[in-house]
Interface confidence: medium
């Protein structure tokens, strides 16, 4: 059945080489004395990408990251030695790994690093305007980085700088045991989560922090932290990880008598990302890896995209789940998790909840308390012992929108772009993996907006070596994606419409919301350009409907490529044909010489079909003819290639090979007659040449044959050799051999 495509595979798979050759990736391959390009800060206004790395901070031009400035910020020799004496790795740990890089004000950034297990922070001057071209470290103003950056570069940190205050989730000690959510800087006393209480935080791995408004009153603003942590005893049998969302009020200043300088509004809830399984057992994706907030229209209600992986070492899988803030708020307004002792199960708290409800921000909106310091003692006591909610937050549609379980990689990062297409708005996800690839995925509504279909558009390799993607930023202004890893930074466009093909159908089949057929090419779609010729169908990707009135040859596509190739009787030959689209199914037809009828090729011992093409073994004269390679996708058939195979009989080849350079055939005839079959080694030599990886040898061989042939024709004008026309074709065809300068413009090789 040719109708069924392969939806779980990327339509286009581009290697790093193909990305480079088609000018679709720009890479900064790092400095010799740096690494770990993990901390990104995008500044669209200045058109800069600031990147924190090992001992360096970079300022890349968003237009082209090859254009950059750098600040060197290493640690002193003394610090490095102390770190080494503490038993740490001199290269991987005893350096200044930048973990925090935030906009502090109009003129400065705030940066913190591990400082060789001695966290340190400072300010970076960037000037008032982009044209100031300032990028320098404030050497006179270093600050203690405790509670801002971890000591250990392996530990994750989530931070957010708003109104001169830094919120950070990190480890505050050398041993990496005292994890907390802190608020530092600013004019107020520092605040933190409760210490030494696993109910608050239990060995967390912080992912990100975001400010989200609750109402039009800024007093209600909350900071949300996304993290994963060990499940608390009794919450789960055995050791398990749970993904979490935590909230704190921006105007929380701690308690008066209890929870002094500690958060009084901290609450956390579990994020569920699972697939319902047989026997009611769900497959859980619990290891939260990254979060992206899609702010659209209403900043109070962003859509939360989370990237998750499985905890199991046996079953490796990744998923993307979407959450709505209304669901998150509903959970935080629901029952608190409660248990009476360490051996009891967690249950929803049934008793009286004190007023104002713990977790509510002190404001005019929800009650008459001006400050958390005024909160009644029973509220503080309750908040301290009930930091977790009983109900989890379920994803929209109760299931992931993207799942990958049958691959050798796992998801690590995500950014999302909302794109206006002809038939609506689509969220295009760019998902980074632990092998240095980026997946471009579009979620397409089926019957309802909630019921989404994932379409994997592209899989792009963006780094030369497989390396985990650890940071990603998307510039809507530049329409570019920026990717960070241990090895370096990469930049690629959000869309490459031209690579989908040169036909309306190919453009339509791509289902890329960025692209549409403009009448002559697949190009960037702009909703403002009101042109009736724009063809696009993201929802269905149906070229038969959208491209049927465009009368081109060959099923509304361009003419197929035509090739002539030569095979030797009893040898094997390979007809290469693989469509650009990995989703297309290929089938072959054969048309005998001088016949109209085409028959579908059946696979047997004589013909073997592979993903790359067709292998014909032990060639016979009857195999001569036309071979047509067709791609079928979404009901649309396209002829990619027409190969004319000429099978050369052994006798003619022998004659060709044994002609003398002077054109006198008598010597050859004589030799041929006197040779025993075992002495006829020419055929073996010929096959050796065909199979030789060094094509130049083949070129030289053919060159000799043509030279002889030309000489023969010059010396005997009246003589027309039986098959010389075939060799003429071969000679002409030689120039057209595909040397695969563009890997994705695949075509058969001709000998």
């Amino acid at each position: 059945n040719y109708q069924n495509g392969k939806n779980n595979v990327p339509r286009l798979k581009l290697s790093y080489k193909e990305m480079l050759e088609s000018n679709n990736v720009i890479t900064f391959n790092g400095l010799a004395n740096s690494s770990s390009y993990h901390t990104f800060l995008l500044d669209e206004e200045r058109s800069r990408l600031y990147v924190g790395a090992k001992d360096h901070i970079f300022s890349f031009d968003l237009v082209n990251i090859k254009d950059f400035q750098k600040i060197v910020w290493p640690v002193s020799y003394t610090r490095r030695d102390e770190c080494k004496w503490a038993g740490k790795d001199i290269l991987k740990e005893c350096a200044n790994f930048i973990k925090v890089l935030k906009a502090y004000n109009q003129t400065h950034l705030y940066a913190c690093g591990t400082g060789a297990f001695h966290p340190i922070c400072t300010y970076i001057e960037i000037g008032h305007h982009p044209e100031d071209n300032i990028f320098k470290l404030e050497n006179s103003h270093f600050e203690n980085g405790r509670g801002k950056s971890p000591y250990d570069p392996k530990l994750l940190t989530a931070s957010l700088l708003i109104d001169g205050e830094l919120y950070s989730g990190t480890a505050a000690d050398f041993m990496g045991r005292d994890f907390a959510i802190f608020r530092t800087l600013g004019h107020h006393h520092p605040i933190r989560t409760e210490q030494h209480d696993s109910r608050w935080l239990n060995d967390p791995k912080f992912i990100s922090a975001h400010l989200i408004s609750e109402s039009d009153n800024p007093e209600d603003d909350k900071v949300y932290f996304f993290f994963r942590e060990n499940a608390i005893d009794g919450e789960h049998s055995g050791k398990a990880t749970h993904a979490r969302i935590g909230q704190i009020c921006k105007n929380d200043f701690g308690g008066h008598r209890s929870l002094v300088n500690k958060w009084t509004t901290f609450l956390k809830a579990r994020l569920i990302c699972s697939v319902p399984g047989p026997n009611g057992i769900d497959t859980h994706f619990d290891e939260l890896q990254d979060v992206f907030l899609m702010n659209f229209k209403d900043p109070k209600n962003p859509v939360v995209y989370g990237v998750f992986t499985t905890s199991s070492n046996i079953f490796k899988g990744s998923a993307v789940c979407m959450y709505s803030m209304s669901d998150v708020r509903r959970v935080f307004l629901g029952p608190y998790a409660h248990r009476d002792g360490p051996n009891y199960q967690w249950v929803p708290y049934q008793g009286r909840v004190p007023y104002p409800r713990p977790g509510t921000c002190p404001s005019k909106t929800f009650g008459g308390f001006d400050s958390t310091k005024d909160l009644p003692d029973d509220v503080i006591t309750f908040a301290r012992s009930h930091p977790a909610m009983y109900n989890p937050v379920f994803p929209m549609n109760n299931r992931p929108i993207v799942i990958k379980t049958d691959v050798n990689y796992q998801f690590t990062q995500i950014v999302v772009d909302r794109v206006d297409a002809e038939d609506g708005q689509y969220d295009v996800m760019f998902i980074g993996t632990d092998v240095g690839t980026v997946l471009k995925v579009v979620s397409i509504p089926k019957e309802t907006w909630y019921d989404l279909e994932e379409v994997l558009l592209e899989e792009m390799t963006v780094f030369r070596e497989p390396t985990a993607i650890s940071a990603m930023e998307l510039s809507t202004k530049q329409q570019q994606l920026y990717i960070g890893s241990t090895a370096g930074v990469a930049q690629l466009p959000l869309h490459r419409c031209d690579i989908y093909g040169k036909a309306c159908a190919e453009c339509c089949l791509a289902r890329d919301p960025y692209c549409a057929w403009d009448g002559s090419a697949c190009s960037r779609y702009f909703p403002t350009a009101k042109r009736r010729t724009r063809r696009q169908d993201i929802r269905n990707g149906d070229p038969l409907t959208h491209c049927s009135d465009l009368h081109h040859d060959n099923h509304h596509g361009h003419s197929p490529e035509e090739r002539i190739i030569y095979g030797v009787e009893n040898s094997s030959t390979f007809l290469e044909c693989s469509p650009k689209s990995q989703r297309a199914l290929v089938y072959w037809q054969f048309q005998r010489r001088n016949e109209e009828r085409k028959e579908e090729i059946r696979v047997d011992d004589h013909i073997i079909r592979t993903d790359q093409g067709l292998l014909l073994r032990s060639l016979q004269q009857k195999d001569s003819g036309n071979y047509l390679c067709h791609a079928v996708e979404h009901g649309f058939i396209q002829t990619l290639l027409k190969v004319t195979l000429e099978v050369i009989d052994t006798e003619h080849l022998e004659e060709l090979l044994h002609k003398d350079d002077d054109g006198d055939g008598s010597k050859t005839k004589e030799m041929s007659n006197s040779m025993t079959p075992s002495q006829k080694v020419w055929y073996r030599d010929f096959m050796q040449l065909i199979n030789h990886p060094n094509l130049n040898t083949m070129d030289e061989f053919c060159e000799q044959v043509w030279k002889r042939d030309r000489k023969q024709r010059r010396q005997r004008p009246g003589h027309t050799p039986g098959n010389s026309n075939k060799w003429k074709h071969l000679q002409e065809n030689k120039k057209g051999r595909n040397r695969r300068t563009h890997e994705f413009e695949r075509a058969p090789r001709s000998v």
Partner: antibody, heavy 123, light 111 residues
Framework: EVQLLESGGGLVQPGGSLRLSCAAS????????MNWVRQAPGKGLEWVSG????????DYADSVKGRFTISRDNSKNTLYLQMNSLRAEDTAVYYC????????????????WGQGTLVTVSS | QSVLTQPPSVSGAPGQRVTISCTGS?????????VHWYQQLPGTAPKLLIY???NRPSGVPDRFSGSKSGTSASLAITGLQAEDEADYYC???????????FGGGTKLTVL
């Protein structure tokens, strides 16, 4: 007014045991980290042990590890120090001190101290 | 032998200014840990005098001030008075798994 009152000190033979208590009042005892600090006659101050508000974190000076046990009863607003295998060098005035977190929550100061109780280890 | 080093004694006449130093290392004061100062009047319990290197708790006269630089800290007392005669202790934390450490103490004599 914050008050810390130590008791339980006295004369004990080497190898013997004592249990010190510290009764707290004037503040929310269950919210604070508490410590024991000692001072040998004519000598300086030495931190002995600390305990977090919920007993989730407990730490000891190397010199007393394995011999002393710190504990608390929040319902009674009382801090304890169980001292076993006492040695002559444990002779000191033992102070109960509250962790203040006045400047930061990393490195608390001791913002309130009791008057101390004398422990003498001698045969 | 204390981890933090203080001069055993200092003295000054009433009205004078005296400073007491507290020298640590890169694993305590130099590691960014806070420094606190305590005053112990004869026969009494210690009392918090300065916290976080330079902050005074309420009730402590502004004649007392503290500072910190690198691996050391200092306490300054201006306008010396007879009632300032006492033992002064600095404290910090010793890493990497921090625990409280005290200086050996400095006896201040008002001449």
């Amino acid at each position: 007014e914050v008050q810390l009152l130590e008791s339980g000190g006295g004369l004990v033979q080497p190898g013997g045991s004592l249990r010190l208590s510290c009764a707290a009042s004037g503040f929310d005892f269950s919210s604070y980290e508490m410590n024991w600090v000692r001072q040998a006659p004519g000598k300086g101050l030495e931190w002995v042990s600390g305990i977090s508000w919920n007993s989730g974190w407990i730490d000891y000076a190397d010199s007393v590890k394995g011999r002393f046990t710190i504990s608390r009863d929040n319902s009674k607003n009382t801090l304890y120090l169980q001292m076993n295998s006492l040695r002559a060098e444990d002779t000191a005035v033992y102070y109960c001190a509250r962790s203040g977190y006045s400047s930061s929550w990393f490195d608390p100061d001791f913002d309130y101290w009791g008057q101390g109780t004398l422990v003498t280890v001698s045969s | 032998q204390s981890v933090l080093t203080q001069p055993p004694s200092v003295s000054g006449a009433p009205g004078q200014r005296v400073t007491i130093s507290c020298t640590g290392s890169s694993s305590n004061i130099g590691a960014g840990y806070d420094v606190h100062w305590y005053q112990q009047l004869p026969g009494t319990a210690p009392k918090l005098l300065i916290y976080g290197a330079s902050n005074r708790p309420s009730g402590v006269p502004d004649r007392f001030s503290g500072s910190k630089s690198g691996t050391s800290a200092s306490l300054a007392i201006t306008g010396l008075q007879a009632e300032d005669e006492a033992d002064y202790y600095c404290s910090s934390y010793e890493g990497p798994n921090p625990y409280v450490v005290f200086g050996g103490g400095t006896k201040l004599t008002v001449l």
